[in-house]
């Protein structure tokens, strides 16, 4: 019962985590304009992995996709790759774990096969979570570096009265969503791995031997049990599950109305 609960909870936690990773990847607010000296600004900039946006006081928001692939910073490409790998692995992990759930019966699938699949999905969730955490952390590091660089350059060339204040960017909501989601996926994966250990069936072989003694008919049944972890090569019904990620081309999004100043 505890094993089923652990497996089920691991699945749910991972599901929430992967949904969060997908949400974070799609979000536009990976970096937001730092309002260091102007808490309310007439023009507010924020950027995502796929496009950058500008929100005006008028309420209009204009977003532009990054239509170049080669012109983008290598770090941004790396973050994109990490997040997509995380999503793909997480999606495959979810698919595998659905079939591995103890509460779901599929044909004559053995417990050893379910244990294997639970472990596989658990590992996939762990790697998926790590990919998301790594991606978000790389982006955060990039922001911190750029933040201090732009701070150092902020008031350069101020010989005259003309100031050119550089726009500095700080952590956006997507980073926090990504960190939490990656952590949840990781926790879910660990729970699946723990559940896997308890899922391993305990095979009890009863070898009945009859001993005929004079005047008595007593049957002795010495019992021995063989514990199988299900990690061996004796696993039957092995299935390989495929998952794929579909990406859509970014399109120019025309200015839309926002509900805040």
């Amino acid at each position: 019962m505890a094993v089923t609960a652990c497996q089920g909870l691991g699945f749910v936690v991972s599901l929430i985590g992967i949904a969060g990773i997908i949400a974070a990847t799609c979000m536009d607010q990976w970096s937001t304009q730092d309002l260091y000296n102007n808490p309310v600004t007439a023009v507010f900039n924020y950027q995502g992995l796929w496009r950058s946006c500008v929100r005006e006081s008028s309420g209009f928001t204009e977003c532009r996709g990054y239509f170049t692939l080669l012109g983008l910073p290598a770090m941004l490409q790396a973050v994109r790759a990490l997040m997509i790998v995380g999503i793909v692995l997480g999606a495959i992990g979810l698919l595998v774990s659905i079939f591995a759930l103890k509460c779901i019966r599929i044909g004559s699938m053995e417990d050893s096969a379910k244990a294997n699949m639970t472990l596989t999905s658990g590992i996939m969730f762990i790697v998926s979570g790590l990919c998301a955490i790594a991606g978000v952390s790389v982006f955060a590091n990039m922001l911190v570096t750029n933040f201090w660089m732009s701070t150092a350059n902020m008031y350069t060339g101020m010989g005259g009265m003309v100031q050119t204040v550089q726009t500095r960017y700080t952590f956006g909501a997507a980073l926090f969503v990504g960190w939490v989601a990656g952590g949840l996926t990781l926790i879910g994966g660990v729970m699946m791995c723990i559940a896997c250990r308890g899922l391993a069936p305990e095979e009890t072989n009863y070898k009945a031997v009859s001993y005929h003694a004079s005047g008595h008919s007593v049957a002795y049944k010495p019992g021995g049990f063989k514990a199988s972890t299900g990690f061996g090569s004796n696993t039957k019904n092995k299935k390989i599950y495929d998952g794929g990620a579909r990406t859509e081309d970014e399109v120019q999004s025309y200015p839309s109305k926002h509900d805040y100043v």
């Epitope: 600004t41 008028s58 209009f60 532009r64 200015p255």
Partner: antibody, heavy 118, light 113 residues
Framework: EVQLQQSGAEVKKPGASVKVSCKAS????????MNWVKQAPGQGLEWIGL????????SYNQKFQGKATLTVDKSSSTAYMELSRLRSEDSAVYYC???????????WGAGTTVTVPS | DIVMTQSPDSLAVSLGERATMSCKSS????????????LTWYQQKPGQPPKLLIY???TRESGVPDRFSGSGSGTDFTLTISSVQAEDVAVYYC?????????FGAGTKLELK
């Protein structure tokens, strides 16, 4: 057709308050930010502040903080600006203006003249 | 606050002539996020409210004659009327739309010679 209809001219004693209205028609009132601009006689334009009719969010020019209070009534598609503790230097024409792309004010009311005798 | 400085204070041109007025800001009005300059030009005739001519420094408002054009980037901007008409006699204001408080220039008065 977009129209911003402002209330009539007001003559107020020093220390009094005045509430200027701006009724919007011909567009979605909650979809556009409303600005208020002051123009003293023979002077240039001075931005007072803005209000988002959707959520009531405001931004003020520090100079008018405490002097002007911006509100909206969504049901009647009307924006209001209340000026308190009136002084002779508050005598001016006050315009309401709708904000559009580029934070530009594309439609303006005809203006409300507020006179505060010294 | 961003200070907007317009020049000249007044400008007298003959009908059909070209009129050029300048507007300088104390800070750059170029937004790095969309590479747009948040500068607006208005025309105000006596006894009337201002009328929007140009936004984003160079985008003409619909219904505005094409003799009006805006140019410039960063801190230096120009409004040009290619062929002045009698109805163009007015005061022209530039405005910072980039940073609060939104600020206007003192205006340039266009007159006919």
């Amino acid at each position: 057709e977009v129209q911003l209809q402002q209330s009539g001219a007001e003559v107020k004693k020093p220390g009094a308050s005045v509430k200027v209205s701006c009724k919007a028609s011909g567009y979605s009132f909650t979809g556009y930010t409303m600005n208020w601009v002051k123009q003293a006689p023979g002077q240039g334009l001075e931005w007072i502040g803005l209000i988002n009719p959707y959520n009531g969010g405001t931004s003020y020019n520090q100079k008018f903080q405490g002097k002007a209070t911006l509100t909206v009534d969504k049901s009647s598609s009307t924006a209001y600006m209340e000026l308190s503790r009136l002084r002779s230097e508050d005598s001016a024409v006050y315009y309401c203006a709708r904000m559009n792309y580029g934070n530009a004010m594309d439609y303006w009311g005809a203006g409300t003249t507020v006179t505060v005798p010294s | 606050d961003i200070v907007m400085t317009q020049s000249p204070d007044s400008l007298a041109v003959s009908l059909g002539e070209r009129a050029t007025m300048s507007c300088k800001s104390s800070q750059s009005l170029l937004n790095s996020g969309n590479q747009k300059n948040y500068l607006t030009w208005y025309q105000q005739k006596p006894g009337q409210p201002p009328k929007l001519l140009i936004y984003w420094a160079s985008t003409r408002e619909s219904g505005v004659p094409d003799r009006f054009s805006g140019s410039g980037s960063g801190t230096d901007f120009t409004l040009t009327i290619s062929s002045v008409q009698a109805e163009d006699v007015a005061v022209y204001y530039c405005q910072n739309d980039y940073s609060y408080p939104l600020t206007f220039g003192a205006g340039t008065k266009l007159e006919l010679k």
